[in-house]
């Protein structure tokens, strides 16, 4: 007789989740020599330990501490790129500008990127059927708490000039409820971070507005200034050209505004 199982509103654990995490871990440690010492089996055990047999609405940052410890990684603190609602372009950028890092360029971010996971209280099983939705079910679910934890640590580590890529096509270019707005902004350390520089990415080809004057950007500037961190903002009118110029900065067309 099948056991009764809690039905959540969100999609279930990503298929082949354990094998995917292990494979990603192995690949990452092969590509990044400074992480060669990492034992991926231990990483998986710690990851699993954070949510297996626990109620998926009762996960805490503390649950992820063993994983955080195993995934400890030093990235150049002045080369951090945050992003909000524009992940693909941010990742394309760091793939070209290899000395800059998004959270997903770190081991823990790379492991979990685009994956969903949850368990069930009092059983050792992974729930492939459904997982809690942040809005409809609960915010203290395994995925949300993971990203809150790693995002906080990533922001805390940042120094000097921190860059953030924002999506200029959205109604709220800066969204206080995003991970960037609710976690990262508040965990930048004013004693280490001098400036937050926002890159507002334009969507439309003919869009020549100065989106740095958007009310939500002004709101971001106000929050940052109150935290004794300087704020600057740049419009990226042509993201395709922007990427091309990062690849080939010598190109003659790259001297004009992008």
């Amino acid at each position: 007789v099948p056991r009764w199982r809690q039905q959540w509103s969100g999609p279930g654990t990503t298929k082949r989740f354990p094998e995917t995490v292990l494979a990603r871990c192995v690949k990452y440690t092969e590509i990044h020599p400074e992480m060669r010492h990492v034992d991926c089996q231990s990483v998986w055990d710690a990851f699993k330990g954070a949510f297996i047999s626990k109620h998926p609405c009762n996960i805490t940052e503390e649950d992820y501490q063993p994983l955080m410890k195993l995934g400890t990684q030093t990235v150049p603190c002045n080369k951090i790129l945050l992003w909000s609602r524009i992940k693909d372009l941010a990742h394309q950028f760091t793939q070209v500008q290899r000395d800059m890092f998004t959270l997903e360029d770190t081991l823990l971010g790379y492991l979990a990127d685009d994956l969903t996971w949850c368990g069930e209280f009092n059983t050792s099983k992974i729930n492939y059927q459904s997982c809690p939705d942040w809005r409809k079910d609960c915010s203290n679910n395994p995925v949300s708490v993971f990203w809150k934890t790693v995002s906080r640590r990533f922001a805390e580590a940042a120094c000097d000039v921190v860059h953030v890529m924002l999506n200029g096509s959205r109604s709220k270019i800066f969204d206080k409820n995003s991970t960037f707005g609710s976690v990262e902004v508040h965990n930048l350390q004013p004693e280490k971070v001098q400036t937050l520089e926002a890159w507002v990415i334009h969507g439309g080809r003919e869009d020549s507005r100065d989106l740095c004057q958007d009310p939500t950007i002004k709101e971001l500037e106000s929050i940052i200034s109150k935290r004794n961190i300087q704020f600057s903002c740049k419009n990226i009118y042509r993201p395709d050209k922007f990427l091309q110029c990062v690849k080939n900065p010598e190109d003659s067309s790259c001297t004009s505004e992008i």
């Epitope: 082949r16 094998e19 292990l22 494979a23 089996q41 992974i126 492939y128």
Partner: antibody
Framework: EVQLLESGGGLVQPGGSLRLSCAAS????????MSWVRQAPGKGLEWVSE?????????YYADSVKGRFIISRDNSKNTLYLQMNSLRAEDTAVYYC?????????????WGQGTTVTVSS | QSVLTQPPSASGTPGQRVTISCSGS????????VSWYQQLPGTAPKLLIY???HRPSGVPDRFSGSKSGTSASLAISGLQSEDEADYYC???????????FGGGTKLTVL
């Protein structure tokens, strides 16, 4: 002792059906992803199908058997199944079940002895 | 036709070192975990190498695995007559959404 034991093979006519079973013992069966692999006479290994651990909700099939074979598991009986329908001559092979071990990064660390399926008129 | 390409045969004399290659792509070897299997005549396959380069207990250290980019290889040093068998590489393939075995390499000890 950790063991897998296949059964259910035999001679069947083209278009016919057969159900293979794989009885597991010596380990917690529902903790493991399980797989079927076959080997045609004188040929190499060919992966056939795979089922996820616990409730077996995730199932995968090789293109050559998709729509004809169904993998399932009964954790209460510690048994893996392969229901084979619309059998063809090219399905003739020794069929092995195998366990995928997470501790060995999903290598197939335990195999059954195999059961022979012959499709012929 | 397998998405993982192995040489159909390899040979060596006792004591020699032989290497068997397994060539794939980003959708399989490039992004996934490689294992190697040994199949002695008339027997079920046996796990020889997992995670590209790890040996299960009981497998002699004469067997070693490696991976580089989208290729993997199995090396057998100090070849012995009992190593005469078929060898298969295997991994998950993201494009097929299934597992894949190489075509197999028949190793002959001369």
């Amino acid at each position: 002792e950790v063991q897998l034991l296949e059964s259910g093979g035999g001679l069947v006519q083209p278009g016919g059906s057969l159900r293979l079973s794989c009885a597991a013992s010596g380990f917690t069966f529902d903790d493991y992803v399980m797989s079927w692999v076959r080997q045609a006479p004188g040929k190499g290994l060919e992966w056939v199908s795979e089922i996820s651990e616990s409730d077996g909700s995730n199932k995968y099939y090789a293109d050559s058997v998709k729509g004809r074979f169904i993998i399932s598991r009964d954790n209460s009986k510690n048994t893996l199944y392969l229901q084979m329908n619309s059998l063809r001559a090219e399905d003739t092979a020794v069929y092995y079940c195998a366990r995928l071990e997470p501790e060995k990064y999903y290598g197939m660390d335990v195999w059954g002895q195999g059961t022979t399926v012959t499709v012929s008129s | 036709q397998s998405v993982l390409t192995q040489p159909p045969s390899a040979s060596g004399t006792p004591g020699q070192r032989v290497t068997i290659s397994c060539s794939g792509s980003n959708s399989n070897i490039g992004n996934n975990l490689v294992s190697w299997y040994q199949q002695l005549p008339g027997t079920a396959p046996k796990l020889l190498i997992y995670r590209h380069d790890h040996r299960p207990s009981g497998v002699p250290d004469r067997f070693s695995g490696s991976k580089s980019g989208t290729s993997a290889s199995l090396a057998i040093s100090g070849l012995q007559s009992e190593d005469e068998a078929d060898y298969y590489c295997a991994t998950w393939d993201d494009s097929l959404n299934g597992r894949a075995f190489g075509g197999g390499t028949k190793l002959t000890v001369l």
